[in-house]
């Protein structure tokens, strides 16, 4: 903590701007005022401080707003966020998208920090869910967002931001998150017609049930055999010889390449050798 | 830079256990979901058990439930695969999976051969 000592005279500063990175620490800390600092943030990223003078600018915001920074400050803290603890953030009060942009754009390109979890964790519980809006911001800079989440956290999400989900963004999603969110992406896209919702719900698929997965076999949507891998096995295993050369279409003829592979080698050995015949692929059950 | 290392593979026989770790060095911070994965030779990589970011709730495939066990000590940066009542066909290279919001991190992987 920089020592109290009062301003040399002519030094006092009356704003924000370029002579303040000559001014050592204890010259901030008795010529800056603290409220010309929150007025006039924004001016702060533009200013080559070092990170020493950064700690004192923070310490004047902190003595200034011993409750938490007003979101006015927040929004222009820029690399001042950076030397923010989480303690620091959970007595913060952020409500605009703009404000959570503004501060995820200082960490991007790196991994999630403390502070960014702490703030995400703060904005999605202000805002009551994770909305579309919110959903779309975070998997635009952290692509991985929603597959790093436990089911328990996924399960909050509300139907209505799945619009915002892109099929990469699920990339990495595990059976048990899918499980959970391919029931939220059947509600959101329920009112959709045949070919337009297979297009949108085929990423979620990884979560369906036998009983979808034979109601899409009744829409011809020739699903293709990477989206069928995916599939979760039990849900794939009841489904007849007819219903997933239904499911496929012309696709078919790939399950003889991924014979040995999981779900489509245990679906063989299920059923009986004179359906699989059918198909004319040489599959052995 | 982010390394993920696996260990305690080896040969065991049917019925037996085994305990494998895995090990991430770097500055993996804030939210991440770990996974074990396993692939036998001309197969795809297949999903084993996942301990999430949050709570350490855990996830496991229907083949392993019951019989294995995921844990993390995050302090440590380090998860675990005890692994009981094995099977000739747990058999394959388990692969450690640590993902973060913004990456995917891989192992090595080790292997693991239930014989007798």
């Known amino acids: 903590e920089v020592e109290k000592t009062a301003c040399p005279s002519g030094k006092k500063a009356p704003e924000i701007d370029e002579s303040l990175i000559f001014y050592k620490k204890w010259e901030l800390e008795a010529c800056v005022d603290a409220a010309l600092l929150a007025t006039q943030m924004d001016r702060v990223n533009a200013i080559p401080f070092t990170y020493e003078q950064l700690d004192v600018l923070k310490h004047k915001l902190d003595e200034l707003y011993p409750q938490g920074y007003p979101e006015s400050v927040i929004q222009h803290l820029g690399y001042l966020f950076l030397k923010m603890s989480p303690e620091d953030i959970r007595k913060w009060n952020v409500t605009s998208l703009e404000t959570l942009k503004a501060l995820l754009e200082v960490n991007k390109g790196h991994e999630m920090s403390p502070q960014v979890a702490t703030l995400i964790d703060r904005f999605v519980k202000g805002r009551g869910q994770l909305d579309k809006d919110t959903l779309d911001t975070l998997t635009a800079f952290y692509p991985g967002y929603l597959c790093s989440l436990s089911p328990e956290e996924l399960s909050s999400v509300p139907p209505s931001s799945i619009w915002a989900v892109r099929p990469q963004d699920l990339d990495t999603c595990d059976p048990r998150q899918l499980d959970v969110l391919y029931p939220k992406a059947r509600l959101a896209f329920q009112n959709m017609n045949g070919s337009e919702y297979f297009v949108k719900i085929q990423s979620f698929l990884g979560g369906a049930p036998t009983e979808d997965l034979k109601a899409l076999s009744q829409q011809n949507v020739s699903m293709d055999l990477a989206t069928f891998m995916k599939l979760r096995t039990d849900a794939v295993l009841p489904l007849t010889v007819a219903e997933v050369q239904k499911l496929l279409g012309p696709h078919v003829e790939g399950l003889k390449a991924e014979e040995r592979h999981r779900p489509v080698r245990d679906w063989i050995l299920r059923q009986r050798q004179d359906d699989l015949d059918t198909l004319g692929l040489g599959l052995q059950g | 830079e982010v390394q993920v290392v696996e260990s305690g593979g080896g040969l065991v026989q049917p019925g037996g256990s085994l305990r494998l770790s895995c090990g991430v060095s770097?500055?993996?911070?804030?939210?991440?979901?770990m996974r074990w994965y396993r692939q036998t030779p001309g197969n795809q990589r297949e999903w084993v058990a996942s301990?999430?970011?949050?709570?350490?709730?855990?996830g496991y495939a229907d083949s392993v439930k019951g019989r294995f066990i995921i844990s993390r000590d995050s302090a440590k940066n380090m998860m675990s695969l005890q692994m009981n009542s094995l099977k000739s066909e747990d058999t394959a290279v388990y692969y450690c999976?640590?993902?973060?919001?913004?990456?995917?991190?891989w192992g090595q992987g080790t292997q693991v051969t239930v014989s007798s």
């Open positions: 999976n640590v993902q973060t919001p913004l990456n995917v991190y």
């Open positions: 770097g500055s993996i911070l804030a939210l991440n979901t």
């Open positions: 301990i999430y970011s949050s709570g350490g709730s855990t």
